[in-house]
């Protein structure tokens, strides 16, 4: 159904007489003032910018010659100023003006809240020509009005490069309350007060608010929107909503859950990603956060060894990412690992413990009693050593790495040799005569290469010298190796 919201203006009499005062309005007809009781002084608005007042000393003549009898005022006729209707109804309103036929190219545009309504709007302009003037009726219709159609509508017409503006038609679409602010889900500390806010608007106003907790009304008397509910504290989870009431009916907000913060659940699925001799990379799946964000986590490490004192190493780390590299571990050792995380309320229980092992490490000591001497042929250097006393954690010895550096007249050349674990001697070919050979030996396990022994130097003379004395590493505690020639 179309709501015809049109109030026809009465016929315009010939100039009705002067208005008191010296101001008039440019879009109130000076030729007649229908729908007003008595003549009131008004503001005269500028021709080009409605709403901008200017003063003018204008007196309107009571009687004019026959020539002006047919001339209508250059103003839109008064129409209904305010239309109230319910959502989804149809509405039609119009503005009308009579224009002398000399102004034949006039067009009327519709504007809403200061913006021109273009395109897909149902605006129809009808022309009713007469001998002297043409009556123009511009109609605007809206089918199934929505709240967004609320606003101030005006007509504009351009004549002689000036804009003539109609009085506004206010469209007020009424419906059920519309929430502009609904309560939000919250996580709160047990027995601590908090606030919930609910705001709804019409039209029609006023809008009254009732609060509902777990399906029961909280307030006996409604509160005018907006409403703030102060809850003194909860001991268990609750669901809150608000009801907004106006003359058109009731709208219920979404129900929001208010959770009580608690300590987190323990992490789960602690996994080993990578093990080395001295570190283990772990990850875990966080448990439920207890409605409070995780702050940090603690990785707890126990050595699984009947001989260890059972002490626990604790490594603190950030809650994210859910991964940590445990360092400073013993090689070839077994560990039990657990993870616990905390939020603002406290620490979770520890996750289920998992077993992890480090791999074997490299030797921690160098071979002992390294001796070096030139054999009789003077083509080879003999090297001898003693097997180092390696710890179990270093793993099984797989061999040795020999480094020999040859230095002569500013030239230096390093060579590496690998020998098996059963050897405790080796022979290397002389690379350069009249040069110094520096030898170092390291033990090798599957865990890697251990430290090199202190260097032992031997001088390789030119051909013709006779000297077979060995060089050796010093006894432990001596500062420098001794070169014996």
């Amino acid at each position: 159904a179309i709501t015809e919201a049109r109030e026809e203006a009465k016929p315009y009499p010939l100039f009705p007489g002067p208005l008191p005062g010296s101001l008039q309005t440019d879009h109130t007809s000076l030729l007649s003032l229908p729908h007003t009781s008595g003549y009131q002084p008004a503001l005269m608005f500028s021709p080009t910018q409605p709403g901008r007042p200017y003063t003018g000393n204008v007196a309107i003549p009571r009687v004019t010659s026959a020539g002006s009898k047919l001339l209508p005022p250059l103003a839109f006729k008064h129409t209904v100023g305010h239309i109230i209707l319910s959502e989804h109804k149809d509405v039609k309103f119009n503005c009308s003006i009579s224009v002398p036929n000399i102004y034949q190219d006039t067009t009327i545009s519709w504007w809403k809240d200061g913006k021109e309504l273009l395109g897909a709007h149902h605006a129809i302009t009808q022309f009713y020509p007469d001998d002297e003037v043409t009556a123009i009726i511009a109609s605007f219709s809206i089918t199934s009005v929505q709240r967004s159609d609320n606003g101030s509508y005006i007509c504009k017409m351009k004549i002689n490069n000036e804009e003539i503006v109609s009085d506004p038609i206010y469209i007020e679409v009424q419906g059920l309350p519309h929430f502009t602010k609904q309560p939000e889900s919250m996580n709160v500390t047990r027995n601590t007060a908090f606030n919930l806010t609910c705001q709804a608007v019409g039209p029609p106003e006023p809008v009254n608010i009732f609060w509902v907790q777990n399906s029961s009304r909280v307030n006996e008397q409604p509160e005018k929107s907006p409403s703030v509910l102060t809850v003194p504290g909860l001991t268990e989870m609750a669901v809150f909503s608000c009801e907004a009431h106006n003359d058109k009916g009731l709208t219920v907000s979404k129900g929001v859950q208010i959770n009580i913060k608690a300590i987190p659940s323990p992490p789960t699925e602690v996994s080993i990603h990578n093990s080395t001799a001295h570190s283990i990379l772990i990850s875990w799946v966080p448990g439920f956060d207890g409605y409070s964000p995780f702050r940090n986590c603690s990785v707890q490490v126990k050595e699984v060894d009947p001989l260890s004192n059972g002490s626990v190493m604790i490594f603190n780390t950030s809650a994210s990412p859910h991964m940590y590299q445990i360092k400073q571990l013993q090689a070839l050792a077994n560990y039990s690992i657990g993870v616990s995380c905390m939020n603002e309320i406290g620490w979770s229980a520890v996750s289920p413990w998992i077993l992890a092992s480090t791999t074997e490490g490299a030797p921690s000591v160098a071979p002992l009693n390294v001796t070096v001497f030139l054999n009789e042929s003077r083509d080879n250097v003999d090297i001898r050593w003693m097997k180092p006393l390696t710890k179990r954690q270093a793993g099984e010895l797989v061999g040795y790495r020999i480094s020999h550096v040859w230095q002569s007249a500013g030239i230096s050349k390093e060579l590496l040799e690998e020998v098996g674990q059963n050897n405790s001697r080796a022979q290397i070919s002389v690379q350069v005569h009249n040069a110094t050979c520096t030898v170092r030996i390291a033990a090798v396990t599957k865990g890697g290469v251990g430290p090199f022994s202190d260097p032992v130097k031997i001088f390789i003379p030119a051909h013709g010298w006779v000297d077979h004395a060995p060089s050796s590493t010093p006894a432990p505690g001596n500062a420098d190796p001794v070169l014996i020639i």
Epitope: V58, P73, Y103, N160, E162
Partner: antibody, heavy 123, light 107 residues
Amino acid sequence: EVQLQQSGPELVKPGASVKIFCKASGYTFTAYNMDWVKQSHGKSLEWIGDINPNNGGTIYNQKFKGKATLTVDKSSSTAYMELRSLTSEDTAVYYCARRRRYGNTYYWYFDVWGTGTTVTVSS
Amino acid sequence: DIQMTQSPASLSVSVGETVTITCRASENIYSSLAWYQQKQGKSPQLLVYAATNLADGVPSRFSGSGSGTQFYLKINGLQSEDFGSYYCQHFWGTSYTFGGGTKLEIK
């Protein structure tokens, strides 16, 4: 006091262009249209056109289309008129005038006139 | 375009006399007419608007009348400052034309 102050006299060569101005004071510039009028020596007045300072919309007398271009600068409350392809026929005094409307009628009038700018076209 | 015919083109009168200047429109312009006075070397000044309304500050010896196609400007008891040129102008439609002017001289 409402005033329309126009630019000084111009001596221009045939075929050239000239841009003259009209600076408004004492009122809200955007509230009224500004019209321009030509008066050749010893002759009557001719309406050139008008401009709406609010939106820059213009209406020209058919005779002056292509000859005159009207513009405004709202920030300085100044109206401009550019005349191009000048000939001796364009030698005249040019006035700006504030246009006003009588209430809600179709009766306009020029209530304030500028001081006038003399444009002389001569080689 | 609407033509405005003003008469007489010139008039020689004495101080104290009454004069009437006529302006005729080529078609009905209702009351959309203004009268201006211009003195030598000066800008025009508004005398009458909407055919019959006296502008601010204009002496009451001036009066405008008429509507449709025939309009009159009457000056009762001419003063020396009234000498100069007088123009009518219509504002009907979208192009406004002036009359040819009437030059008022002292006899």
